[in-house]
Interface confidence: low
Amino acid sequence: TLNSVLNSNAIKNLPPPLGGAAGHPGSAVSAAPGILYPGGNKYQTIDNYQPYPCAEDEECGTDEYCASPTRGGDAGVQICLACRKRRKRCMRHAMCCPGNYCKNGICVSSDQNHFRGEIEETITESFGNDHSTLDGYSRRTTLSSKMYHTKGQEGSVCLRSSDCASGLCCARHFWSKICKPVLKEGQVCTKHRRKGSHGLEIFQRCYCGEGLSCRIQKDHHQASNSSRLHTCQRH
């Protein structure tokens, strides 16, 4: 259940590295429960750490991805998990730490290839219990405390949509994430063909507003399905 996943003991007992730092902005990975690590505005221990529930990667920090914390666990229970370092297993780009991307099921350096043009590759192999250490996490940055007290306006930098003011969501623009307007009726939206494909977007759009869904424009006829325009429409 959700409660058991959010229980601190459940988090502590997750297999490393998934239990290391499950989704606090700017957090460094801790090797064992009780070790201090930077999380948000103050230092916290794993013992009192509360993970961040999520539905998709965009709701997590730049150094995080959204997934079920346990192998073969309840797919409906997802939290923000620490990104995967170089040479670690992955299933999509968002799982890999900044400067890396997912290729053939492994996080590799984006310096090695033109990774933005790559097509995501799906792997069927499940995660092993590969133990991550603290190395490679030195690039994690903490946001100023101001971020947590004032909601970001349009164009403000953010880690997740909850950092943004009402009517805005947190979406990628190049490799930064900023607050953008939630889409209104009639506005062009992005329809993802398969789960996880949003990880390839350099310029993410927000989702459609309440009562709207992203659908093919009825009067928009193109030669191929791939070029059809999607807009936010009433349910």
Epitope: H114, G117, E154, H173, W175, S176, I178, K180, V188, S227
Partner: antibody
Framework: QVQLVESGGGVVQPGRSLRLSCAAS????????MHWVRQAPGKGLEWVAI????????YYADPVKGRFTISRDNSKNTLYLQMNSLRAEDTAVYYC?????????WGQGTLVTVSS | SYVLTQPPSVSVAPGQTARITCGGN??????VHWYQQKPGQAPVLVVY???DRPSEIPERFSGSNSGNTATLTISRVEAGDEADYYC???????????FGGGTRLTVL
């Protein structure tokens, strides 16, 4: 108030080097990818380079690849462009910019003239 | 490398609607951003992510993007809209930012 101020431009001979700086203020510089864009006199905009918010990756336009180096010092809120082996065709106004959607800011530019 | 094609010039009478196009191979799959640049000034973003508009830009400016063409539409054109307009995309295959050649909008 967001400000980007370029400096370091001037007249330089072909084959020589120049280093441009861009001082940023009014926003959290370390959280944004930064770009250099140039514009030759009477011509259109030409992208030069991008550096990720944390400096981890850099990409360059083909005409400057191997000659120009983009870098940043987040502790000083400053973006740099080291230009080596300058050519006459590098003559342009050089802008630093965030190019970040609604948070899109440009400096006023600094003129680089490569002439013998 | 990816190429964006704009008409060199577009002319329109005050109060009319101006449409500036930006052509590129399957540009509809990319996010397009539009800039306005007046002489001696730095460019100013007028539309981003195809159709979103910065809060300080008038509603007269709008954008669309589909197939092989993106379009910047300026309704009820004013004399102050006279400027050069550039489209811009990120080309993921080369990891480059690409600008169109620019379009000079003349208000008759």
């Amino acid at each position: 108030q967001v400000q980007l101020v370029e400096s370091g431009g001037g007249v330089v001979q072909p084959g020589r080097s120049l280093r441009l700086s861009c001082a940023a203020s009014g926003f959290t510089f370390s959280r944004y990818d930064m770009h250099w864009v140039r514009q030759a006199p009477g011509k259109g905009l030409e992208w030069v380079a991008i550096i990720f918010y944390d400096g981890s990756n850099k990409y360059y336009a083909d005409p400057v690849k191997g000659r120009f180096t983009i870098s940043r010092d987040n502790s000083k809120n400053t973006l740099y462009l080291q230009m080596n082996s300058l050519r006459a065709e590098d003559t342009a106004v050089y802008y630093c910019a965030t190019l970040a959607a609604a948070f899109d800011y440009w400096g006023q530019g600094t003129l680089v003239t490569v002439s013998s | 490398s990816y190429v964006l094609t704009q008409p060199p010039s577009v002319s329109v009478a005050p109060g009319q609607t101006a449409r500036i196009t930006c052509g590129g191979n399957n540009i509809g799959s990319k996010s397009v951003h539009w800039y306005q640049q007046k002489p001696g000034q730095a460019p100013v973003l007028v539309v981003y992510d195809d159709s979103d508009r910065p809060s300080e830009i008038p509603e007269r400016f709008s954008g669309s993007n589909s197939g092989n063409t993106a379009t910047l539409t300026i309704s009820r054109v004013e004399a102050g809209d006279e400027a050069d307009y550039y489209c811009q995309v990120w080309d993921s295959s080369s990891d480059h930012v690409v600008f169109g050649g620019g379009t000079r909008l003349t208000v008759l």
